[in-house]
């Protein structure tokens, strides 16, 4: 019988008949080791590979370039998959991006992009996006014209300032841009008026820090 093909992403996992959300192992092109990821099989048809998740502030997201490159945290909770893995996955085929957000009042919203990929490390993991829709604001809170990834030890933003140092976390900062889902986690009551919080400008404004976020990707042809 034909040898089983390894899963490239959570879409492959779903299409193989595994339709429960949870942790699965995927084999990404050009990556030497398999990678454990959280697969969301519930939202909008399932098949989503989670690349970022925030929910309780248990994980420190104020990290350097190398850690954002290779990832940190645990897919069972808060984590960043790793820019090298995100680059490798989104180089396999065309992907869309969905971002799920929740505020401290329990309101949920999402932003979705028809096309999503990032450049390689030499390109500072530059963000490429097209086709924004969703309920988290009419305008995109991610820079559509492209932005390089910055961390506290790698200042690639478009500002006279150092966005990643000032706003904390690694992100595709512009100057500094309308979002930062890797900012400081602030609890209820402490989450207003924060420059360096978990921000999605067109959902809750420039200084409201969100309660939970999930970034996930799925092939366009799913």
């Amino acid at each position: 019988r034909e040898e089983e093909k390894p899963f490239r992403d959570c879409a492959d996992v779903y299409q193989a008949g595994f339709n429960k959300s949870g942790i699965y192992t995927i084999y990404i092109n050009n990556m030497p080791e398999p990678k454990k990821v959280f697969c969301n099989m519930d939202v909008n048809g399932g098949g989503w590979t989670v690349i970022q998740h925030r929910e309780d502030g248990s994980l420190d997201f104020q990290r350097g370039w190398k850690e954002y490159k290779m990832g940190f945290g645990n897919p069972s909770g808060e984590y960043w998959l790793g820019n090298e893995f995100i680059f490798a996955i989104t180089s396999q085929r065309q992907y869309m991006l969905r971002i799920e957000l929740m505020d401290w009042e329990g309101n949920r919203a999402y932003s979705q992009y028809d096309r999503f990929h990032i450049g390689n490390e030499k390109q500072n993991y530059r963000l490429y996006l097209k086709g924004h829709t969703g309920t988290a604001g009419k305008q995109s809170s991610l820079i559509l014209h492209g932005a390089d990834f910055s961390t506290k030890d790698a200042d690639n933003d478009n500002c006279m300032c150092k966005c990643a140092l000032m706003l904390t976390g690694g992100w595709w900062f512009d100057a500094c841009g309308p979002s930062n889902l890797n900012g400081m986690f602030y609890t209820a009551g402490q989450n207003h008026g924060k420059l360096n919080g978990i921000k999605w400008h067109y959902f809750k404004g420039p200084s409201y820090s969100l309660r939970s976020t999930t970034m996930m990707i799925r092939p366009l042809d799913f």
């Epitope: 512009d174 100057a175 841009g177 309308p178 008026g193």
Partner: antibody
């Protein structure tokens, strides 16, 4: 390269009007709050007015409230200051200045125009 | 309005020597978000002001590392570790924690 090029200054009699312009280039103008700051001859700096990126929020210094009007045209990448009922004490070099950070996060003036002199004299 | 008081108002310095400018505010500039909205600007002769330090201690891009800002609450300091001839001009502190934004009266740095 970020540029703020000012125009519209000159000599005007007390009680008359003048309109200053500030043409922006090299950045996404519609994403930034903008300010007017002035400097009387031989004196220090004084903040005059602020307008948010969309134009929905506007503030004025008490010394100009009711006489000056700040506005912006994001389609033309331009900032304006309409100055009415001018007084001798309004004589100053007027600077337009851009917020350091986008999306109306206040952290100071990242870029300044070259300044334009307004002289109010009879 | 918040009153910003700088000292000294005049500062003659020998090239290569350090320099220090103090800025005091009439109320605390420490915002509830943990930031001090205090900037330092330099206005060189015949030029527009330029941003040196933002949020109390953050050096703007392109500003030499001989410039540093420190302080919190009501007392702030701008230090130049080794003054160079190109550093001459008037230095202003400015607060934006409380509306309206207000400037200090300026400190004129000159070379001895």
């Amino acid at each position: 390269e970020v540029q703020l090029v000012q125009s519209g200054g000159g000599v005007v009699q007390p009680g008359r009007s003048l309109r200053l312009s500030c043409a922006a280039s090299g950045f996404t103008f519609s994403s930034y709050g903008m300010h007017w700051v002035r400097q009387a001859p031989g004196k220090g700096l004084e903040w005059v007015s602020y307008i948010s990126s969309s134009g929905s929020t506007i503030y004025y210094a008490d010394s100009v409230k009711g006489r000056f009007t700040i506005s912006r045209d994001n389609a033309k990448n331009s900032l304006y200051l309409q100055m009415n009922s001018l007084r001798a004490e309004d004589t100053a070099v007027y600077y337009c200045a851009r917020d350091l950070l986008d999306y109306d996060i206040w952290t100071g003036y990242g870029y300044w125009g070259q300044g334009t002199l307004v002289t109010v004299s009879s | 309005d918040i009153v910003m008081t700088q000292s000294p108002l005049s500062l003659p310095v020998t090239p290569g020597e350090p320099a220090s400018i103090s800025c005091r505010s009439s109320q605390s500039l420490l915002h509830s978000n943990g930031y001090n909205y205090l900037d330092w600007y330099l206005q060189k002769p015949g030029q527009s002001p330029q941003l040196l330090i933002y949020l109390g201690s953050n050096r703007a891009s392109g500003v030499p590392d001989r410039f540093s800002g420190s302080g919190s609450g009501t007392d702030f300091t701008l230090k130049i570790s080794r003054v160079e001839a190109e550093d001459v001009g008037v230095y202003y502190c400015m607060q934006a924690t409380h509306w309206p934004p207000t400037f200090g009266q300026g400190t004129k740095l000159e070379i001895k």
